[in-house]
């Protein structure tokens, strides 16, 4: 059965955008204006994993692009990374878990935790221009915190 | 309480079709997934098949030139379709309801249906 | 032959830790899944998402998954927990069980 999707963009708490940097990074910065262009577009699928109320497993692949963000052990650290995909095979329901994040919502505010590694969540720098990382941290300087906004597809 | 209830013929000559469906009391019927598992007897499980609400399906490789799965969901109804069968599909047969909040695995199961094929 | 494998048999006294086994490739990328099944009856999920215990499931249940096992141990193993149990997972976008374990409890 085919998985649903939707299209997004996302912004972390302090209102930067994520864009690519190189072909398997992305980055975190304040766009304005036509450089909102620039922001990735997320196609958000709703993929197999714990689901409760405020909780809901979601993939984050980047639209009609064969990339995912998946969660995979660098050096023994969890890290997030940029994978390329067969597109024949990709996405469905059932993914392998590293691509899979817990989507969830406290106080209009959404958190992504990798469902690979709990505890660890896409965060983003307090610094411009920074890469999007896979941390371990909750409520510290880095940002864990995102708005998600609706693409029409 | 969500129950599961199942009927259908239980002695099948070899070269017929097996036909089974499942009714399904309690709980939203559009919210989940409802697959078909046999087990032979004595033997282990095997995953027939699903299908969700909208009548969209997966199947197993090894039965799916054979299977057919559909939904009725006006009346809260899936069923199962198995033709040419062959003594190696003698086995019970039991429905069951894949849901999210276990992730998508399934939760709830019918009380199985034994089938016979036998000349 | 199942893409997953189980070992036939597992033994265990009363009280003690039993722990069955589930391997396949690569099987930690994925979910596993476990059912306990009494003769004569439907099976029952006492495992979901690799370690999560649906409600009314026994605290001696547990479950992990990571490389290519996955492990269902229930200490302090009770009479009432004879049963077979299977391990569940997908495997090219449709549902895959393991063969089967029966435990024995001895005694």
């Known amino acids: 059965a085919p998985v649903r999707s939707l299209n997004c963009t996302l912004r972390d708490s302090q209102q930067k955008s994520l864009v690519m940097s190189g072909p398997y990074e992305l980055k975190a910065l304040h766009l304005q204006g036509q450089d909102m262009e620039q922001q990735v577009v997320f196609s958000m699928s709703f993929v197999q994993g714990e689901e409760s109320n405020d909780k809901i497993p979601v993939a984050l692949g980047l639209k009609e692009k064969n990339l995912y963000l998946s969660c995979v052990l660098k050096d023994d650290k969890p890290t997030l990374q940029l994978e390329s995909v067969d597109p024949k095979n990709y996405p469905k329901k059932k993914m392998e878990k590293r691509f899979v994040f817990n989507k969830i919502e406290i106080n209009n505010k959404l958190e992504f935790e990798s469902a690979q590694f709990p505890n660890w969540y896409i965060s983003t720098s307090q610094a411009e221009n920074m890469p999007v990382f896979l941390g371990g941290t909750k409520g510290g300087q880095d940002i864990t915190d995102f708005t998600m906004q609706f693409v029409s597809s | 309480q969500v129950q599961l209830q199942q009927w259908g013929a239980g002695l099948l000559k070899p070269s017929e079709t097996l036909s089974l469906t499942c009714a399904v009391y309690?709980?939203?019927?559009?919210?989940?997934?409802w697959s078909w598992i046999r087990q032979p007897p004595g033997k282990g499980l095997e995953w027939i098949g699903e299908?969700?609400?909208?009548?969209?399906?997966n199947y197993n490789p090894s039965l799916k030139s054979r299977v057919t799965i559909s939904v009725d969901t006006s009346r809260n109804q899936f069923s199962l379709s198995l033709s040419s069968v062959t003594a190696a599909d003698t086995a019970v047969y039991y429905c069951?309801?894949?849901?999210?909040?276990?992730?998508?695995?399934?939760?709830?199961w019918g009380q199985g249906t034994l089938v016979t094929v036998s000349s | 032959q199942s893409v997953l494998t189980q070992p036939p048999s597992v033994s265990v006294s009363p009280g003690q830790t039993a722990s069955i086994t589930c391997s396949g490739d690569?099987?930690?990328?994925?979910?596993a899944f476990w059912y306990q099944q009494k003769p004569g009856q439907s099976p029952v999920l006492v495992i979901y998402?690799?370690?999560k215990r649906p409600s009314g499931i026994p605290e001696r249940f547990s479950g992990s998954n990571s490389g290519n096992t996955a492990t269902l141990t229930i200490s302090g193993t009770q009479a009432l927990d004879e049963a077979d149990y299977y391990c569940?997972?997908?495997?090219?976008?449709?549902?895959?069980f393991g063969g089967g374990t029966k435990l024995t409890v001895l005694g």
């Open positions: 998402l690799d370690n």
């Open positions: 690569k099987l930690g990328d994925k979910f």
């Open positions: 569940y997972a997908w495997d090219n976008a449709y549902e895959v």
């Open positions: 299908i969700d609400h909208s009548g969209s399906t």
């Open positions: 069951a309801r894949a849901s999210p909040s276990s992730g998508w695995t399934l939760d709830y």
């Open positions: 309690g709980g939203s019927f559009s919210d989940y997934y």
